[in-house]
């Protein structure tokens, strides 16, 4: 599998979507896990709806959401109010049985966010009528490794 | 706190419809979906169905597809439930209620009901 | 479709008592993901459902602990190990291991 990047900013929500076969995928189950290391194993974060058919509401743990589109074959994972710890190498995973198949792999960056230098008198924050969920903006942008490009730092 | 707050009761005649509203408050409204369920002395406690806040997409029981309609309106964080076609037997108290998909994995909170007498 | 029976159908109680509802499910609630999706509601006179027990036997925010679930697979408990007058309405267990289905209702009261 070939890793894509996604970039996001700290403090806002970062958007992730693995898109894969409706058909093949059909009636299983989809997960979030976060990879421990090179060789190591890829821990849960969060899967989709206990019921298959209700894959389309948002399952979280913490800040993360998932949500599946089973008849398009896009799974979606928002990762809110990112922050640099979130910074690493994640799957999209299809679950059946005990086993798991790799959808992609993810390698999610954390950037600076810029609004951090400027002045407070320049910040915006949403009125009191206004839901946090109308205020914040879901921003990837996602590429792919370049062949050679080592998803985790060399350890000495 | 959080608080679903549910329209008033409602007196229709057969054959028509009625729609009927749930405001959540104290709350993300789009990160929890909501149900709606029917309360008849007959049936005690039935599932209609529940619909993605975020998305609108929508699962029913079997039994409710053709009679009950659920929607949203993100923008003043409310669900909605139109029933058409009403006849006696949908004389019930309606209550909408929220899904939490955090860890509880239940219908955590409830609003106050509204009920519907269907009568000529 | 899953049915889940509850007995009894009434219990009457002294306040102080211990009072134990059972329910039964004609289909496993255990899920793949290791969880068994069954909960317990209160609907006390004149009000909404309330949810009491969460997965079988967590207790939601606020419940106090003398209620209790238990089960597994398909038989589950709820008991109440001290009555009081707060706790009398009608429970209802729930399952949402096969889309969404509330078992009849068991109605606790005054003896």
């Known amino acids: 599998h070939n890793t894509t990047v996604f970039q996001g900013v700290a403090g806002q929500s970062l958007q992730v979507s693995c898109p894969y076969d409706s058909m093949k995928h059909w009636g299983r189950r989809k997960a979030w896990c976060r990879q421990l290391g090179e060789k190591g194993p890829c821990q849960r974060v969060v899967s989709t709806h206990n019921l298959w058919l209700l894959s389309f509401l948002r399952r979280w743990n913490g800040s993360t959401a998932i949500t599946d589109d089973t008849l398009g074959g896009t799974l979606t994972i928002t990762l809110r109010n990112l922050q640099p710890h979130d910074a690493g190498l994640y799957q999209c995973q299809s679950l059946h049985g005990s086993e798991a198949d790799t959808l992609r792999k993810v390698l999610v960056e954390v950037l600076a966010d810029p609004l951090d230098h400027r002045d407070a008198g320049d910040l915006w924050f949403p009125g009191e009528s206004e839901s946090f969920e109308d205020a914040h903006v879901e921003h990837s942008i996602s590429r792919s490794l370049l062949e050679g490009e080592i998803p985790f730092p060399p350890t000495s | 706190q959080v608080q679903l707050q549910q329209s008033g009761p409602e007196l229709v005649r057969p054959g028509v419809s009625v729609k009927i509203s749930c405001k959540g408050s104290g709350y993300t409204f789009t990160d929890y979906a909501m149900h709606w369920v029917k309360q008849s002395h007959a049936k005690s406690l039935e599932w209609i169905g529940v619909?993605?806040?975020?998305?609108?997409?929508?699962n029913y029981n079997q039994k409710f597809k053709g009679k009950a309609t659920m929607t949203v309106d993100k923008s003043s964080s409310t669900a909605y439930m139109e029933l058409a076609r009403l006849t006696s037997e949908d004389s019930a108290i309606y209550y909408c209620?929220?899904?939490?998909?955090?860890?509880?994995?239940?219908?955590?909170?409830w609003g106050q009901g509204t009920s519907v007498t269907v009568s000529s | 479709d899953v049915v889940l029976t509850q007995t009894p159908l009434s219990l009457p109680v002294n306040i102080g008592d211990q009072a134990s509802i059972s329910c039964k499910s004609t289909?496993?609630?255990?899920?793949?993901?290791?969880?068994?999706?069954l909960d317990w509601y209160l609907q006390k006179p004149g009000q909404s459902p309330q949810l009491l027990i969460y997965l079988v036997s967590n207790r939601f925010s606020g419940v106090p602990d003398r209620f209790s679930g238990s089960g597994s697979g398909t038989d589950f408990t709820l008991k109440i190990s001290r009555v009081e007058a707060e706790d009398l309405g009608v429970y209802y267990c729930?399952?949402?291991?096969?889309?969404?289905?509330f078992g009849g209702g068991t109605k606790l009261e005054i003896k």
């Open positions: 729930f399952q949402s291991n096969y889309l969404y289905t």
């Open positions: 619909i993605s806040t975020y998305s609108s997409n929508t």
């Open positions: 289909k496993s609630l255990l899920n793949s993901d290791g969880f068994t999706y």
């Open positions: 209620a929220r899904d939490d998909g955090h860890y509880v994995y239940a219908m955590d909170y």
